[in-house]
């Protein structure tokens, strides 16, 4: 059966300056390939986090994605600013040259409240 990407929250609200967790779980790690978080869709989408060795300021993984059986690809965004508002997508790729996007969660809106 095809891998499913589950983002359980449609939206989260967070006060400016606070942190928020965006949840994402997969039903399978197959096919082999990376998981990436984006804000927005299409050509203009912005890469927010990749579960690799890259470093992303203010964004960290919630659980240890290096563990073989880990299906949790949630992230934490710290010190949220109004510019962080938008819809965030957890996207599963199949490894290749280039990697192929095969499934996405339904998206979680981040709504930033004034402090």
């Amino acid at each position: 059966t095809e891998v499913k990407v589950i983002q359980p929250e449609k939206s989260v609200s967070v006060a400016a300056g606070d942190s928020t967790v965006l949840n994402c779980t997969l039903t399978s790690l197959l096919p082999v390939g990376p998981i990436r978080w984006y804000r927005g869709v299409g050509q203009s989408r912005q890469l927010i986090y990749s579960f690799t060795t890259e470093h992303f300021p203010r964004v960290t993984n919630v659980s240890d994605a290096t563990k073989r059986s880990n299906l949790d690809f949630s992230i934490r965004i710290s010190n949220v600013t109004p510019e962080d508002a938008g819809t965030y997508y957890c996207v599963k790729f199949q490894r290749g040259s280039p990697d192929t996007e095969i499934q996405s969660g339904g998206g979680t809106e981040v709504y930033v409240l004034a402090k």
Partner: antibody, heavy 119, light 108 residues
């Protein structure tokens, strides 16, 4: 049974205001995000606004931003749409729609209330 | 925003015939797509969600298929009550939530 009953429509002049209400029953109102969707005469459906169950999260279509205000009173199981600075192009049937709990599609709709903006 | 284009605009068919309605998205929405039926004087009704899941109480003559940018609503054998306007809606790229322009299924 889920029921959504809109009211408050009518005929107004451009620049005037109107407040629509949607009385909800048959479900735990405060647990669900709610939306307004409209349909101009002879046209398709257009999403207008949404509000989260708590009332904390609110979004508007660009066409109404700054003129319309969505709100809810969970103690009265009622959704509202305050419409200011109305324009002829706001003429439409306005539907109240309950969202599914997982995704932003609409599992129940009201019958709608007609708003006519004309000089 | 994601634009949904429905085709054809009008479908003229007889009861008992098969109806095939199309909805094309300007960019991938995976399977985050719903279909609604609208009849004059009635509340719109959810038929299909997640591209292919039938809503509660919807007869099995209605089926949805597709993913990415191409979607289809099929009514296997039209009944008199199926003559109506049908809309697709995507809920992946948001806000705003967007609808297609509609397909009218009329009696031939």
């Amino acid at each position: 049974d889920v029921q959504l009953v809109e009211s408050g429509g009518g005929v107004v002049r451009p620049g005037e205001s109107l407040r629509l209400s949607c009385a909800a029953s048959g479900f735990t109102f405060s647990s669900y995000d709610m939306n307004w969707v409209r349909q101009a005469p002879g046209e398709g459906l257009e999403w207008v606004s949404l509000i989260s169950g708590s009332g904390e999260i609110i979004y508007y279509a660009d066409s109404v931003k700054g003129r319309f205000t969505i709100s809810r009173d969970n103690s009265k199981n009622t959704l509202y749409l305050q419409m200011n600075s109305l324009r002829a192009e706001d003429t439409a049937v306005y539907y109240c729609a309950k969202e599914n709990n997982r995704y932003r599609f609409f599992d129940y709709w009201g019958l709608g209330t007609l708003v006519t903006v004309s000089s | 925003e994601t634009v949904l284009t429905q085709s054809p605009g009008t479908l003229s068919l007889s009861p008992g015939e098969r109806a095939t309605l199309n909805c094309r998205a300007s960019q991938s929405v995976y399977t985050y797509l719903a279909w609604y039926q609208e009849k004059p004087g009635q509340a719109p009704r959810l038929l299909i969600y997640d591209a292919s899941s039938r809503a509660t109480g919807i007869p099995d003559r209605f089926s949805g298929s597709g993913s990415g940018t191409e979607f289809t609503l099929t009514i296997s054998s039209l009944e008199s009550e199926d003559f109506a306007v049908y809309y697709c809606q995507q809920y992946y790229d948001r806000p705003p939530l967007t609808f297609g322009g509609g397909t009218k299924v009329e009696i031939k």
